[in-house]
Amino acid sequence: NQDLPVIKCVLINHKNNDSSVGKSSSYPMVSESPEDLGCALRPQSAGTVYEAATVEVDVSASITLQVLVDTPGNISCLWVFKHSSLNCQPHFDVQNRGVVSMVILKMTETQAGEYLLFIQSEATNYTIVFTVSIRNTLLFTLRRPYFRKMENQDALVCISESVPEPIVEWVLCDSQGESCKEESPAVVKKEEKVLHELFGTDIRCCARNELGRECTRLFTIDLNQTPQTTLPQLFLKVGEPLWIRCKAVHVNHGFGLTWELENKALEEGSYFEMSTYSTNRTMIRILFAFVSSVARNDTGYYTCSSSKHPSQSALVTIVEKGFINATNSSEDYEIDQYEEFCFSVRFKAYPQIRCTWTFSRKAFPCEQKALDDGYSVSKFCNHKHQPGEYIFHAENGDAQFTKMFTLNIRRKPQVLAEASASQASCSSDGYPLPSWTWKKCSDKSPNCTEDIPEGVWNRKANRKVFGQWVSSSTLNMSEAMKGFLVKCCAYNSLGTSCETILLNSPGPFPFIQDSIS
């Protein structure tokens, strides 16, 4: 049980005046005082591995990662970054400590990652791990959390690799369905990264920072619940971690759980079991199946079996790239003025989408609900019976999806009229799109019943206002008509609306507005 070398890891921030990629040196620069990075031996690790606290660096900042080694004799070293070896030149300070430095000038995203320093001394070999990440408001990210088993104990760590570092919370619920909604009294929140109580019905982990909140649910098969009519499906991208929990309750401890992938037992080390007695002295067992980084061959049917319950399965599908599956054909709807109606998009997506509903250049919040068949649905009901074009847009980092909807509100026309020196125009927005008549009011026809057969030009649906179709009709004025009153009427299946105009008038003259239903 020898005395280990005393290792000190520090971060030195520099005032910038040059630029380069990582250099392993003692490059002279104007520097701030060193910051300790809490380098410590990683407990229970194979070999001697020291770990430094994560370093957060602003874009374009220059830093030095430095290790001071209090060990007798010479040392040799090697830096490894992203599988590339970098030159390492140790030197000794006035206190005869070995000093190894890695200079990162003008930090960029490509220089972020894990820097490994391998040191060999006369007495021992060891590794020092530095994790360098970028802190920059332009590079703020919020990544969906994922789970990892805590080393040497039955607990899950929730990790979200986001910038700025998010606040992580577990959202736990022991009820079923609707009562597990976010603000329900049945929901318990724990603002911590590690969760030991893994027996709950519904377990989610959420991460939040300046960009919002992202959550991941622990995928669970409950052998005491009636299986869904469709097989539950879990999508993952290559390289992501897989976690499935199988849960079962029985009157006593005399039962066991097992996981199989395509009828083959999972390998040792890719599952772990926990059990506890519940308040009514029944035994709860949970068995986790996990893969730290999935590959295509991890796709398949994962079946949880029990000696006392019917087995249940889930289909795990590993994809190279995320997707959004939905029909993108545009849809038209016509509804009555007081009819209740919601737009609806049914989709299957992985990772979970972020979405918006847009109308009249205004974005509305988008809610999505998971369905039992593996699909999700987003509904939009807040249209306030305004006709026009509504757009659903979804994206998830790998895929984008847009769907257009047109909403028409059945109502009788409403006419707007205006006149210029040479013509009179009427427009209407009723639906179905109206037809037009023009009548002349004269001594012969005081009720304005005399048709004007010529000079009328109808433009149906020529103007689109945020998706709302407008029909217009124009009367070209002849000299003989000047000084007369004319009436334009728009009619559809729901009614008629008219506007009377005095020709030769410079503007609209709503002398009489008739409404004949």
Partner: antibody, heavy 123, light 108 residues
Framework: QVTLKESGPVLVKPTETLTLTCTVS??????????VSWIRQPPGKALEWLAH???????SYSPSLKSRLTISKGTSKSQVVLTMTNMDPVDTATYYC???????????????WGQGTLVTVSS | EIVMTQSPATLSVSPGERATLSCRAS??????LAWYQQKPGQAPRLLIY???TRATGIPARFSGSGSGTEFTLTISSLQSEDFAVYYC??????????FGQGTKLEIK
Amino acid sequence: QVTLKESGPVLVKPTETLTLTCTVSGFSLSNARMGVSWIRQPPGKALEWLAHIFSNDERSYSPSLKSRLTISKGTSKSQVVLTMTNMDPVDTATYYCARIVGYVDWLLPFDYWGQGTLVTVSS
Amino acid sequence: EIVMTQSPATLSVSPGERATLSCRASQSVSSNLAWYQQKPGQAPRLLIYGASTRATGIPARFSGSGSGTEFTLTISSLQSEDFAVYYCQQYNNWPMYTFGQGTKLEIK
């Protein structure tokens, strides 16, 4: 050289609020995984953890004292402030601040401590 | 809340001899246990974390063992500067940390 130094009143009256400041140097509280905890020790008794704060503002409190405690970062990034309301003579103790370092999946507990400040609660 | 119980409350050992201090947790804390040494008028000093990993600069005569609920701190050959109070602390359900009541190691 990592140092932590506690400062605050040495004498507090019952029902008053105690405000303690921990000034750190040699490490940064803007570093992603650095945190500071407050721990107290009544004369001749054991240590009791009170609260902690991490550089990302994640904070936590002792369940038995949660309603009385508030931990925050001071105006300077090198300070952590603890306030404890409704002080009582039983709160007489030496109050320490200590550094904590969190890694991705493990934790280094209190590796550096301040020298402590004795707070007496008496009328 | 996890309760940490240390035994004995006081341990009398002669310099050069071996000292064994025990710590028991009311429920499993896995390997997330630390040991601290505190001398009169001083702040505690981290000796061991992860149940068995020595902190930086701690001599090899200090060793920790155990996992789950039973833990031991062993000082193989006591030096005069080792006489102090020793505390165990669990950080398994961090961010909640609890300390034992301490063992006083005195010169026999």
